[in-house]
Interface confidence: low
């Protein structure tokens, strides 16, 4: 019955030494749960055997049930086929009938399911993206496969996580599991390692030129780990960048052109999944001046018998501040004429009659004068001067 | 197996100046980046700077940048440390290093180290 009685009767001697029968004690205890009502709300874990292809459901009890339709081991069901169900009844002495009749919606098998890394490598820095894949078909229905992650204190419910603006070069551990019909049935940990971040920026300590030819840089490298530094150099729209080793703090630039604005910038990098370029550190110098090229395509020609038109084309290189053309005019080793333009082109009058001259013309920058461009020319006789004569006669 | 042994460590006033050499032995000079470091009396270990092999790269730490030089002999197989502007509190017993690596300022990338040289700055 639902209620039972539990009588007990004591006999015991009284000091006269006579029996006395002392009264009788009833205790009500309450009725047995049922055990539908007992195991109404039993969870089930079920674990995965690989080499059998099979399940087993371990059914999340307190004490040793009895199993009816199946046989349980330690409240254990065995060789479970994915995606079958089956039922087993659960009973125990501490409750009554009705028994629990328990339906086990087997999972489909682990190995169809794989935790994969879906982490772009180009964000491996801080970026971390796990997503679980099905390699393989099954017959479950896949509406009530749930996914868990759990990745520090957060917790999300997706298929597929991204955690972002992580730290570089960090360990981070992310625990998951796949639940069917709300049933545990396989659980996957991962450690990633965050890549390596781009490098900090280097210190640029001073960055000078202190000759036409040349310039140095010397810098502090980045704190962060790079493997090489990356120097590039622009004059006007010419790039040249040069890899230099992780351990170098000073660059000699040499072969450099005279009286030229260099911008330099300079970049730590790290080759890790991909290659990642710290941020620039930047600088500029303007090379001293030299002395400019030779001007060129020089003519003389003769605008009247005593008369030169010399005109020249530019240096190639100026290599200096200002622009100046000079025209010396020697007849033996004398300096004649010593003229200064803004551009190549000298009208020399009045020279002497049938003389030799030597006309040398050069640029001056402002700081140096470049190589003459020699030239020699005669003067004609006074043509005039002959025809008057002749005349006369 | 490189021996190093320093020397050039003494008593200088503050302001005054001191080179230290680092003579090596027993191994090929011009494979090894060289290093000095310091420990002042109850002090960790501390770096203060750093050559390459070819002694084209040098590297300071930031309270002796601008008053003390590294340079390097490979003939002579010897690394020097001018030290100019010394204050009191540069006093420590000062060691030479060899690196096969060579990365700057780690004391771990350091295989072979010196007994020391002590340098005192006091009036």
């Known amino acids: 019955s639902d209620a039972y009685l539990n009588a007990s009767e004591t006999t015991t001697l009284s000091p006269s030494g006579s029996a006395v029968i002392s009264t009788t004690t009833i205790a009500t205890t309450p009725s047995k749960p049922t055990c539908d009502e007992k195991y109404a709300n039993i969870t089930v874990d079920y674990l995965y055997n690989k080499e059998t292809k099979l399940f087993t459901a371990k059914l999340n009890v307190n004490e040793n049930v009895e199993c009816g339709n199946n046989t349980c081991t330690n409240n254990e069901v065995h060789n479970l086929t994915e995606c079958k169900n089956a039922s087993v009844s659960i009973s125990h002495n501490s409750c009554t009938a009705p028994d629990k009749t328990l339906i086990l919606d087997v999972p489909p098998g682990v190995e169809k399911f794989q935790l994969h890394d879906c982490t772009q490598v180009e964000k491996a820095d801080t970026t971390i993206c796990l997503k679980w894949k099905n390699i393989e078909t099954f017959t479950c229905d896949t509406q009530n496969i749930t996914y868990r992650f759990q990745c520090g204190n957060m917790i999300f419910d997706n298929k597929e996580i991204k955690l972002e603006n992580l730290e570089p070069e960090h360990e981070y551990k992310c625990d998951s599991e796949i639940l069917y019909n709300n049933h545990k049935f396989t659980n996957a940990s991962k450690i990633i390692k965050t890549d390596f971040g781009s490098p900090g920026e280097p210190q640029i300590i001073f960055c000078r030129s202190e000759a036409a030819h040349q310039g140095v840089i010397t810098w502090n490298p980045p704190q962060r780990s790079f493997h090489n530094f990356t120097l590039c150099y622009i004059k006007e729209t010419e790039k040249d960048c040069l890899n230099l080793d992780k351990n170098l703090i000073k660059y000699d630039l040499q072969n450099l052109k005279p009286y030229t604005k260099y911008v330099l910038s300079l970049h730590a990098y790290i080759i890790a999944k991909v290659q990642r370029n710290g941020s620039a550190a930047m600088c500029h110098f303007t090379t001293k001046s030299a002395p400019p090229s030779q001007v060129w395509n020089m003519t003389v020609s003769m605008t009247s018998d005593n008369s030169m038109h010399v005109k020249c084309r530019p240096p190639r290189d100026r290599n200096g501040p200002h622009e100046r053309y000079h025209l010396e005019v020697e007849a033996g080793n004398t300096l004649v004429r010593n003229e200064s333009h803004k551009n190549c082109d000298f009208r020399v009058k009045d020279l002497q009659y049938s003389t030799d001259y030597t006309f040398k013309a050069y640029f001056h920058n402002g700081d140096y004068p470049g190589e003459p461009f020699i030239l020699h020319h005669s003067t004609s006789y006074n043509s005039k001067a002959h025809h008057h004569h002749h005349h006369h006669h | 197996q490189v021996q190093l042994q320093e020397s050039g460590g003494g008593l200088v006033q503050p302001g005054g100046s001191l080179r230290l050499s680092c003579a090596a032995s027993?191994?090929?000079?011009?494979?090894?980046?060289m290093g000095w470091f310091r420990q002042a009396p109850g002090k960790e270990r501390e770096f203060v700077s750093s050559?390459?092999?070819?002694?084209?790269?040098?590297y300071y730490a930031g309270a002796v940048r601008g008053r003390f030089t590294i340079s390097r002999d490979n003939a002579k197989n010897t690394v020097y440390l001018q030290m100019n502007s010394l204050q009191p509190e540069d006093t420590a017993v000062y060691y030479c290093?060899?690196?096969?690596?060579?990365?700057?300022?780690?004391?771990?990338?350091?295989?072979?180290w010196g007994q020391g040289t002590l340098v005192t700055v006091s009036s």
């Open positions: 290093a060899a690196s096969s690596t060579w990365n700057n300022n780690d004391p771990t990338e350091y295989e072979y």
């Open positions: 027993g191994g090929t000079f011009s494979d090894y980046g």
């Open positions: 050559i390459s092999w070819s002694g084209n790269s040098v």
